[in-house]
């Protein structure tokens, strides 16, 4: 019967595990005439059989680590051998067992990591393979430290990475590590592979010696330097060193400033390169940077502070041209006038700041001079003689030196003699009734006229009238402005009404002076007025509870899992449908009822995160009136990109004949995000054929050496394979091809005979 | 002894047809293809077609369609061509042949000739 | 179809001679699929080398055949007087199946 077993010719695949003796037939295919026999041909490695009868079977145990897949061809023939159907690709994967133990490249490993070196930093590798699948727990492996010697206060100072061999400090090690009182550590490490879960695993181990060297790169401590220096520049302030010498140093500016006056050389002294002035900036925060050759950074960036050391470069300024402050007729001895408020842009608490208040003096001199005192430091007028007379002198003029340790400056005090204030505000009616108004009332409008009246003498404080809602708007929905030439008072709205939270409002209104009532003399009913305020309702739109709602998920959701929701409330009381504007990618739906948003697709950081869309909320009924807010979906990075090579390298070329091994440089990039260390690449050769000529070595995380292994090549091009990984988790490998042509050259350049100009290789090696 | 007898020579007129045989033995006359090839006097090889008894399958030179008919007798273990419509451009000698059932694949045994002559 | 080409069509050559007879095919074909046959005058063909370079039954071992792609040939060594006789080389790669159209031996 058809089915599993039998059947036409056809493409098909089949999965068969290693290491098992042959127990069945793999297909018997039928024939259609003319077809009469089958042939078999492609990977079958004497293994795969067909018999002319269409019989496809094996004889003998495969194994994946020979080959993990065998591609196949089968074709139906005639009884003239002339094939007449096919041939068809017949695919056997070989399914992995675990069959193989890891095993690490060396049995002994040194290296060396600076005392201080950042805390997750690799400083060294550790490698094991197994020949078994790495898609499979098989080929999993999972490393460990078994032991750390010495052990201090039972504190580990190395890290692994389970699934890298990257050994790094944990953040003690970063902290304590000290060459000065233990140079060396070993460590003994295992790997096992099925990802470390199984009692079955196969386990290696090797030992890892390690030397603990100085870190030199330290921050410097704080600069003190002094604003305004008459040096001539750069002068050099400090200095940084990195470890080794041929470090790249450079600086950053954290703060973006217009004019960064600081720059560093490639001794790693750092200079000022301009006078700085304080009163411009106190102080700068800026960044020490070492990276290598390739502009990576090296380690952590130091923080460098500068602090600017004040000099008493600034005189004390007076808060206006003229200060005018009013006194009473009657005030009483020692009662404060007011209080001079100069300002000095020196430092803050300091001798360059402090100031001195002196009265030099007073016009006129009547009835005599020294009516006046003012506080030496605070500067507060006080009324110094006697109570004043306004119709013996209506007005004093003050002149007051304002004195740092260095600078005088001179301020200018007018005195009004004012009329007693012992008349209030009254007003010219108690109620002003009942107001009607929409909700929607713009901001701003005038919605109402009040006036009250003092009899105390015009345009002074004892006349002047402020108004004060003094209850019914707790909101802070009203305000009073006031005329000041007729004290009328204009009630404004300043924030929006609302039918739903207050329909109406009693309030209630104070009418007061800014000059304080003679003694005896006190407010009362006449200087209050009410009035009410009625809100009518108007149809509102829904209100979010955010304008910007946020979510942040994995960029590998499930389609249909959760990622966020939204929340809208209608004023009037109305339900809500929801929809989203705006998702041009076609991720997300949202549940018109809930406002649960949901994917509906694959996510994709690397298409760009956040992702940002609109949300409208209308109401169901009423006027469907809607508004908009933001849902923004933060994707947090898979390792889901395999790395690729950074650039395109065309063009690659080596003058032929080769007089020496010649090496070429090459960088690796991934779109996954790397935080703090970068890629981590490692590199190989994609394959086995590939090494007798050429031989690849890691320079850094994203840059790899691709060298010759001899001078014998042809005069054309080579395809290098290059199989990079990314060690994450899962680690992702891509492979990918360097093309590399072997020419003849005229002054270093690949020499071309005329009409062959196409694709010219440009970057010799 | 494997061996391809072929019927004697043929003078026929033209407009007429003719059937040659060809009779197998010394070996399983339904394992193999009977082919047919033409030899026009001081001229090469033509292939014809071929019948493969077994199912009475048989494939012609798209040349020959309509002018060679293949049939086999499995019981008589005997291929037969008939030529139709015959002209003077039929005149030549005709082999049959015997094609392995195997890789490879060719001609390993030959009859020993029919000659067909078309002369009015 | 395939087009068998061969050269020379006539040639003779002297007892003990090296002879070498050549067919291009017009498209390229397995080497296993190209067949020579010897037919002396009033004889039907015999099959001489199959699939390029075998000896079928019988062959003297002077004969040798090569060849691959679109290009093949027949060698005789040493040339001998029984070796006179038509040499026709045969696709049988696919339908039609198609022959040379002859090399003629004769002995010098």
């Known amino acids: 019967q058809e089915g599993k077993f039998s059947g036409p010719l056809k493409p098909m695949t089949f999965s068969i595990y290693e290491g098992q003796e042959p127990s069945q037939i793999i297909f018997q295919f039928k024939a259609n005439p003319p077809a009469v026999t089958f042939e078999l041909t492609g990977e079958t490695d004497n293994i795969f059989v067909i018999e002319r009868e269409g019989l496809l079977y094996y004889n003998r145990a495969l194994d994946r680590e020979t080959r993990s897949t065998h591609n196949l061809q089968v074709a139906a023939l005639d009884a003239n051998g002339i094939i007449v159907e096919g041939p068809v690709p017949i695919t056997i994967k070989v399914k992995d067992i675990n069959d193989n133990r890891p095993t690490f490249l060396q049995s002994k490993y040194e290296g060396s990591v600076r005392q201080n070196s950042r805390p997750g930093k690799p400083f060294l590798y550790v490698n094991a393979t197994d020949l078994d699948d790495p898609a499979t727990p098989n080929g999993q492996l999972y490393y460990q430290i078994v032991i750390q010697l010495p052990m201090i206060n039972n504190v580990m100072y190395f890290q692994i990475n389970n699934k890298t061999g990257a050994i790094s400090l944990t953040r003690e090690g970063s902290q304590e590590l000290n060459p000065a009182k233990n140079p060396s550590y070993n460590l003994v490490i295992s790997v096992k592979d099925m990802g470390g879960q199984s009692e079955n695993s196969f386990s290696d181990t090797t030992s890892v010696d390690i030397i603990v060297t100085e870190n030199i790169w330290k921050a410097p401590k704080p600069v003190e330097m002094v604003e305004n220096s008459t040096d001539p520049h750069p002068i050099k302030i400090t200095q940084v060193r990195w470890n080794d010498p041929g470090a790249q140093y450079s600086l950053v500016d954290k703060e973006k400033l217009p004019r960064f006056p600081f720059s560093i050389d490639q001794e790693g002294d750092i200079y000022v390169t301009q006078p700085l002035d304080r009163e411009e900036k106190d102080a700068y925060v800026f960044y020490a940077v070492a990276k290598d050759e390739y502009g990576k950074p090296l380690s952590y960036p130091l923080e460098i502070h500068v602090k600017v050391k004040d000099i008493n470069d600034n005189p004390p300024t007076c808060p206006s041209p003229v200060t005018v402050f009013e006194v009473q007729e009657n005030e009483r001895l020692g009662n404060s006038i007011g209080t001079l408020t100069a300002h000095d842009r020196d430092e803050e608490n300091t001798a360059n700041s402090f100031l001195n208040y002196r009265i030099v003096e007073q016009t006129p001199k009547l009835p005599m001079d020294g009516l006046f005192l003012i506080q030496t430091y605070a500067g507060m007028l006080q009324l110094a003689k006697q109570s004043l007379k306004k119709q013996d002198t209506p007005q004093y003029n003050l002149t007051i030196e304002v004195s740092d340790k260095d600078f005088k400056t001179l301020c200018f005090v007018q005195i009004n003699v004012i009329d007693i204030n012992d008349q209030i505000p009254i007003f010219e009616k108690s109620d002003y009734g009942n107001l009607t108004l929409a909700e929607d009332t713009n901001i701003g409008s005038t919605i109402l006229t009040i006036q009250a009246t003092d009899a105390d003498e015009p345009f002074t404080g004892s006349s002047k009238i402020l108004y004060h809602i003094i209850k019914g708007d707790s909101e802070g929905r009203l305000g009073v402005d006031t005329d000041p030439h007729t004290n009328t008072g204009y009630v404004i709205i300043k924030k929006p009404l609302d039918f739903e939270t207050a329909a109406v409002s009693n309030i209630v209104f104070k009418a007061e002076n800014p000059e304080p009532l003679v003694f005896g003399v006190k407010y009362n009913a006449s200087s209050f007025a009410k009035f009410t305020l009625i809100v009518t309702d108007v149809n509102e739109a829904p209100q979010f509870s955010q304008h910007v709602f946020q979510a942040k998920v994995s960029e590998d959701v499930a389609i249909g899992t959760k990622v966020g929701n939204v929340t809208a409330k209608d004023p009037e009381g109305l339900d809500i449908s929801y929809s989203l504007r705006g998702d041009t990618r076609g991720w997300l739906k949202i549940d018109h009822v809930t406002g649960e948003i949901f994917s509906v697709a694959p996510l994709d950081r690397e298409a760009g995160s956040p992702y940002r869309v609109q949300v409208v909320a209308t109401e169901v009924g009423g006027s469907s009136l809607s508004s908009v807010s933001e849902f923004h979906l933060i994707l947090m990075d898979v390792n889901d990109n395999p790395p690729r090579l950074a650039k395109d390298y065309t063009g690659l070329f080596f003058c032929h004949p080769l007089s020496a091994p010649g090496s070429l440089i090459f960088e690796a990039t991934d779109d996954d995000q790397h935080l703090f260390r970068g890629p981590h690449f490692t590199f190989s050769l994609g394959s086995g054929s590939l090494q007798n000529d050429w031989e690849v070595s890691k320079i850094n995380g994203t840059h790899a050496r691709l060298s010759t292994r001899h001078t014998e090549f042809e005069e054309r091009e080579y395809v290098v394979l290059i199989r990079i990984n990314d060690g994450g988790r899962p680690p992702l490998e891509g492979i990918v091809s360097l093309p590399v042509t072997f020419c003849s050259c005229v002054e270093g350049s690949c020499f071309r005979p005329a009409g062959h100009q196409t694709g010219i290789p440009t970057v010799g090696m | 002894q494997v061996q391809l007898q072929q019927s004697d020579a043929e003078l026929v007129k033209p407009g007429a047809s003719v059937k040659i045989s060809c009779k197998a033995s010394g070996s399983t006359f339904t394992d193999h293809t009977i082919h047919w090839v033409k030899q026009r006097p001081e001229q090469g090889l033509e292939w014809i077609g071929y019948i493969y008894p077994v199912y009475g399958y048989t494939q012609n030179n798209e040349k020959f369609k309509g002018k060679a008919t293949l049939t086999a007798d499995k019981s008589s273990s005997t291929a037969y061509m008939q030529l139709n419509s015959l002209t003077s451009e039929d005149s030549a000698v005709y082999f049959c042949?015997?094609?392995?059932?195997?890789?490879?694949?060719?001609?390993?045994?030959w009859g020993q000739g029919t000659t067909l002559t078309v002369s009015s | 179809e395939i087009v068998l080409t061969q050269s020379p069509a006539l040639m003779a050559a002297s007892p003990g001679e090296k002879v070498t007879i050549t067919c291009t095919v017009s498209s390229s074909i397995s080497s296993s699929n190209l067949h020579w046959y010897q037919q002396k005058s009033g004889t039907s063909p015999k099959p001489w080398i199959y699939g390029t370079s075998n000896l079928a039954s019988g062959v003297p071992v002077r004969f040798s055949g090569s060849g691959s792609g679109t290009s093949y040939s027949l060698t005789i060594s040493s040339m001998e007087a029984e070796d006179a006789a038509t040499y026709y080389c045969q696709q049988w790669s696919s339908y039609p199946f198609t022959f040379g159209s002859g090399t003629k031996l004769k002995m010098k």
């Open positions: 042949a015997r094609s392995r059932d195997s890789n490879p694949y060719y001609f390993d045994y």
